[in-house]
């Protein structure tokens, strides 16, 4: 069965995800994906890294962590009720039948107050506003303007108390992480 | 225009070896997962083996992995399938597939296949 | 391994019919589940992916349906062109599973 992580509609929910590179920067693709983890690769994929960078993503995903220490959790931006479901962690591991898959569930709560108005920064500087995607026909570029702004105050209550180490290291033992090498 | 063509099948003795090719054109080979089903005379479809697009990832049928191999030479738009070992049971037509793909999918179905290539083991 | 069972193994209708072919699986596989068309001596066609998407250039008249372990593939009004063997796929579980195939005859 999946673990089940929660947030309130208007927050930034967090699904955590971990691995330990065999050394710095000997990176793994991952992919995150709505939906429960196929065979191959994930469904509906919402993020994707591959062995340097972040090379997909969509609006309202990406990674708050440092991705390229293995922190590979998922954060979602401003979550609606729509945005609740099963999502899939999956670190691709090269070999045979090595990918380790993690099945997590996001249920979403109806706001209990409206949020207050919020700080913003620019997020752009992040991430590279050039991505190369794999695809179909010939390679395609995608070119982004800006990225949405993160609002800094909408953290979940799960990604504030990640950022205590205790939590952290408790997440990292319940068996979402993988070490390599 | 998308094609596939499989050669290197034919009639090989219990205990044998062959390897298959799959000749690629008219798409970004090393953009697809690419995969092998097999069909024996007369039976369903089985899946045998696939590979992600750098080769780095291969998944198999469990009771085929010892003996099968899939591999890609992606500057050549080739996949292959070495087979050791071969037994009686392993006749079939082995059809080379390309995994689905588009952003934001995954490649877990296979949108073109090729014409197959006809493996008999036979002493 | 996830088991694909698939009904009826066999089935002979007319030109015009409505014919349904159901796939059952052997645990849930959400909508991870993909139908196939093959004619004799010839490779398999994708017909429908995750249950119940339309593969490009596949007519209308084709859909699919279903979720959790029951699927079915509908023809709405069968054409002499869709006489052919029709395969399911799962692809939540490894290994990747096939149904056993149903045949569709001319009645």
């Known amino acids: 069965s999946e673990v089940e992580y929660r947030a309130e509609v208007g927050q930034n929910a967090y699904l955590p995800c971990f691995y330990t590179p065999a050394a710095p920067g000997n990176l793994v693709p991952v992919c995150w994906g709505k939906g429960a983890c196929p065979v191959f690769e994930c469904g509906n994929v919402v993020l994707r890294t591959d062995e340097r960078d972040v090379n997909y993503w969509t609006s309202r995903y990406w990674l708050n962590g440092d991705f390229r220490k293995g922190d590979v959790s998922l954060t979602i931006e401003n979550v609606t009720l729509a945005d609740s479901g099963i999502y899939c962690c999956r670190i691709q591991i090269p070999g045979i039948m090595n990918d380790e898959k993690f099945n997590l569930k996001l249920v979403i709560k109806p706001a209990k107050v409206t949020p207050a108005p919020t700080r913003q920064r620019d997020f752009t500087a992040a991430f590279p506003r050039m991505l190369t995607t794999r695809g179909h026909g010939p390679a395609e570029t995608q070119t982004l303007g800006s990225l949405p702004d993160i609002n800094l105050t909408q953290i979940s209550t799960l990604a504030n108390e990640l950022r205590d180490s205790r939590l952290a290291n408790d997440l990292r033992d319940s068996g979402a992480t993988i070490r390599i090498g | 225009e998308v094609q596939l063509v499989e050669s290197g099948g034919g009639l090989v003795k219990p205990g044998g070896s062959l390897r298959l090719s799959c000749a690629a054109s008219g798409f970004t080979f090393s953009d697809y997962y690419m995969t092998w089903v097999r069909q024996a005379p007369g039976k369903g479809l089985e899946w045998v083996a696939s590979?992600?697009?750098?080769?780095?990832?291969?998944y198999y049928l469990d009771s085929l992995k010892s003996r099968f191999t899939i591999s890609r030479d992606n500057a050549k738009n080739s996949l292959y399938l070495q087979m050791n070992s071969l037994r009686a049971e392993d006749t079939a037509v082995y059809y080379c597939a390309r995994g689905y793909y588009y952003y934001g999918s995954s490649p877990n179905y296979f949108d073109y296949w090729g014409q197959g290539t006809l493996v008999t083991v036979s002493s | 391994d996830i088991q694909m069972t698939q009904s009826p193994s066999s089935l002979s209708a007319s030109v015009g019919d409505r014919v349904t072919i159901t796939c059952r699986a052997s645990?849930?596989?959400?909508?991870?589940l993909t139908w196939y068309q093959q004619k004799p001596g010839k490779s398999p066609k994708l017909l429908v992916y995750n249950a119940k998407t339309l593969a490009e250039g596949v007519p209308s008249r084709f859909s699919g349906s279903g979720s959790g372990t029951d699927f079915s593939l509908t023809i709405s009004s069968l054409q002499p062109e869709d006489f052919a063997n029709y395969y399911c796929q799962q692809h939540y579980g490894t290994p990747l599973t096939f149904g056993q195939g149903t045949k569709l005859e001319i009645k």
């Open positions: 590979i992600n697009y750098d080769g780095r990832n291969t």
């Open positions: 645990e849930n596989i959400y909508s991870y």
